[in-house]
């Protein structure tokens, strides 16, 4: 299996009750606006074929996509949560900037691409869905990276 390096976050990042609560509140707010409950972005298909040691790298890719293609374009929505949560997630992304995989990561890119394609295909409702799954993103980052 490919070796991942620098793919670690300090657990203190996930032990801040205020920002954790705000992240979950943002996800809840967005999920209320999400009418497409049949489609899931972060779930078993995303992790399929990805070993536990590769998952932080996988979630880094998902985090970066979510920030750049979803949260930044939608930054005026779901206030006041968005203005607090986006900088928090951006800091996590920055801390994972040196997280890389040595070796073939095609299987990871394939899974991430499916998530990206789903969001793009759904358009704005895909972006809303991605925001509604920020609780899953948060939990997946925590479980994979600490």
């Amino acid at each position: 299996a490919p070796i991942s390096s620098h793919c670690r976050l300090d657990k203190s990042n996930f032990q801040q009750p205020y920002i954790t609560n705000r992240t979950f509140m943002l996800a809840k707010e967005a999920s209320l606006a999400d009418n497409n409950t049949d489609v899931r972005l972060i779930g078993e298909k995303l992790f399929h074929g990805v070993s536990m040691s590769e998952r932080c790298y996988l979630m880094k890719q998902v985090l970066n996509f979510t920030l750049e293609e979803v949260l930044f374009p939608q930054s005026d929505r779901f206030q006041p949560y968005m203005q607090e949560v986006v900088p928090f997630l951006a800091r996590l992304s920055n801390r994972l900037s040196t997280c890389h995989i040595e070796g073939d990561d095609l299987h990871i890119q394939r899974n991430v691409q499916k998530l990206k394609d789903t969001v793009k295909k759904l358009g704005e409702s895909g972006e809303i869905k991605a925001i509604g799954e920020l609780d899953l993103l948060f939990m997946s980052l925590r479980n994979a990276c600490i």
């Epitope: 609560n21 979950f24 996800a27 809840k28 999920s31 209320l32 409950t37 049949d38 899931r40 779930g43 078993e44 992790f47 070993s51 536990m52 040691s53 509604g132 799954e133 609780d135 899953l136 948060f138 939990m139 997946s140 479980n143 600490i146």
Partner: antibody
Amino acid sequence: EVQLVQSGAEVKKPGASVKVSCQASGYTFSDYYIHWVRQTPGQGFEWMGWVNPDTGGTRYAQKFQGWVTMTRDMSNTTAYMELPRLRDDDTAVYYCARDLTGYDYYDRWGQGTLVTVSS
Amino acid sequence: QSVLTQPPSMSVAPGKTATITCGGNNFRNKRVHWYQQRPGQAPVLVIYYDSDRPSGIPERFSGSRSGNTATLTISRVEAGDEADFYCQVWDFLADEAMFGGGTKLTVL
């Protein structure tokens, strides 16, 4: 075939400890979290926590924090759950179950281990 | 006391449809999973992510969710379906798995 095989039934006195094992086979042990869930007639199912077989990292339910210990042995693909200072109300069937994400569903369960606490 | 509310029991005649509900607060952004537990046996996953069916589970089993209620539907009920059925979600704020109290399905 994916299997989780647990150790046999235990009878313990109050104050004693118990260690239940869960041997996994038929899949890559390190790729799924192993959760422990207990079932009692009074309380129904109670989630106790999980162990990440890849790192040995754990997450415990608030009720069991500082009490339960979950470990794993990669060499024999076995997860363990230890409960010290048993009380009468710890009488339950203890299950291990596997989960891909750490926060989702359990697609395979062990057969269960009945732990009876009685003086 | 369970945070997820299920009817304790229900009876259904063979060939009919059984509908088991699971209610809870803020279900909107939670994923609901269902397990079947026959007497003396371990639970078996029958529905995950609200409505997905694992391989090996008959098509007669289906799941849905509307608002704060999730529903497990068993069509053309058979005698072998008699069991306890439990719903489960992950509560992200508590960071724990939560289970319903279970519904005992009796096939008449």
